[in-house]
């Protein structure tokens, strides 16, 4: 008799999830000497322990504590780059500007980036068919709780000037419901963080508008200012040129506005 299985609205666990997490861990610890002490089998066991045999709508931050402990990692608190809805450019930037870090440049972020996972209550199986969708099913699902937990810690770690890359092509350049808007903004520590500097990335070639005047950016400025953190904003009109100038700052064309 086939066993009844809960059908969720979201995609199932990424295929070869255990192998992917383990392989990523090994690769990361090989590339980053300061993390060579990490036992990747223990990391996988802790990751698995956070969601296996648990109801995928009843996951808590506590479930991820053993994994968080194994993934302890010092990041330069004044070199943190947050992003919202523009992950690829943020990652391209930190690949060039090697002294700056997105969450996905840390071990924990690297392990889980672009992956989906969930289990089932009272069985040791991973659910490859479907996983809960944040909106349609429940917010306390394994993926959402993981990102909320690590994003909160990442924001709490930040100091001095924190940068955030925002997508100027979206209708809501700053979205209160994004991870940045709902978690990271509220966990920046005013005693440590002096300024949040937003980089609004333009999409259109001929787009010369000042998107720093966008109502959602003004909303972000208001939230940040109320938290006693200064706010500044820059338009990045030419993201391609921006990246090129990060690579080659001496280039003569890099003195003009980008």
């Amino acid at each position: 008799v086939p066993r009844w299985r809960q059908q969720w609205s979201g995609p199932g666990t990424t295929k070869r999830f255990p192998e992917t997490v383990l392989a990523r861990c090994v690769k990361y610890t090989e590339i980053h000497p300061e993390m060579r002490h990490v036992d990747c089998q223990s990391v996988w066991d802790a990751f698995k322990g956070a969601f296996i045999s648990k109801h995928p709508c009843n996951i808590t931050e506590e479930d991820y504590q053993p994994l968080m402990k194994l993934g302890t990692q010092t990041v330069p608190c004044n070199k943190i780059l947050l992003w919202s809805r523009i992950k690829d450019l943020a990652h391209q930037f930190t690949q060039v500007q090697r002294d700056m870090f997105t969450l996905e440049d840390t071990l924990l972020g690297y392990l889980a980036d672009d992956l989906t996972w969930c289990g089932e209550f009272n069985t040791s199986k991973i659910n490859y068919q479907s996983c809960p969708d944040w909106r349609k099913d429940c917010s306390n699902n394994p993926v959402s709780v993981f990102w909320k937990t690590v994003s909160r810690r990442f924001a709490e770690a930040a100091c001095d000037v924190v940068h955030v890359m925002l997508n100027g092509s979206r209708s809501k350049i700053f979205d209160k419901n994004s991870t940045f808007g709902s978690v990271e903004v509220h966990n920046l520590q005013p005693e440590k963080v002096q300024t949040l500097e937003a980089w609004v990335i333009h999409g259109g070639r001929e787009d010369s508008r000042d998107l720093c005047q966008d109502p959602t950016i003004k909303e972000l400025e208001s939230i940040i200012s109320k938290r006693n953190i200064q706010f500044s904003c820059k338009n990045i009109y030419r993201p391609d040129k921006f990246l090129q100038c990060v690579k080659n700052p001496e280039d003569s064309s890099c003195t003009s506005e980008i």
Epitope: Q65, M68, K69, T72, Q73, T74, L108, G109, R153, K192
Partner: nanobody, 124 residues
Amino acid sequence: QLQLQESGPGLVKPSETLSLTCTVSGGSISSSSYYWGWIRQPPGKRLELIGSIYYGGSTYYNPSLKSRVTISVDTSKNQLSLKLSSVTAADTAIYYCAGGYNYGPVGQWPSDYRGQGTLVTVSS
């Protein structure tokens, strides 16, 4: 619940070494669950990180103070210490010791626990 209490002289002469101690209660200073640091706030200015020390003994010092600072722990006394040499009037501040949870991504500035602070004045 962790509690931190700073102690040390309230007055230090210019060019001398400032020495402060922080006694930790409610938890072990040698636990891998925490990292520790010193912060200061000069009159009318923002808080400034002096430096921090991690489980295993590695340290981070604010580049602007690096040549003058030493932070260490005494596990037998459950204490954190700060030494700041060659002080000037610019080192006059309230000095705080601080503790932070040591899991996931962590920075150099522990901010989960903080002592009451102790005022140190540099004057002859």
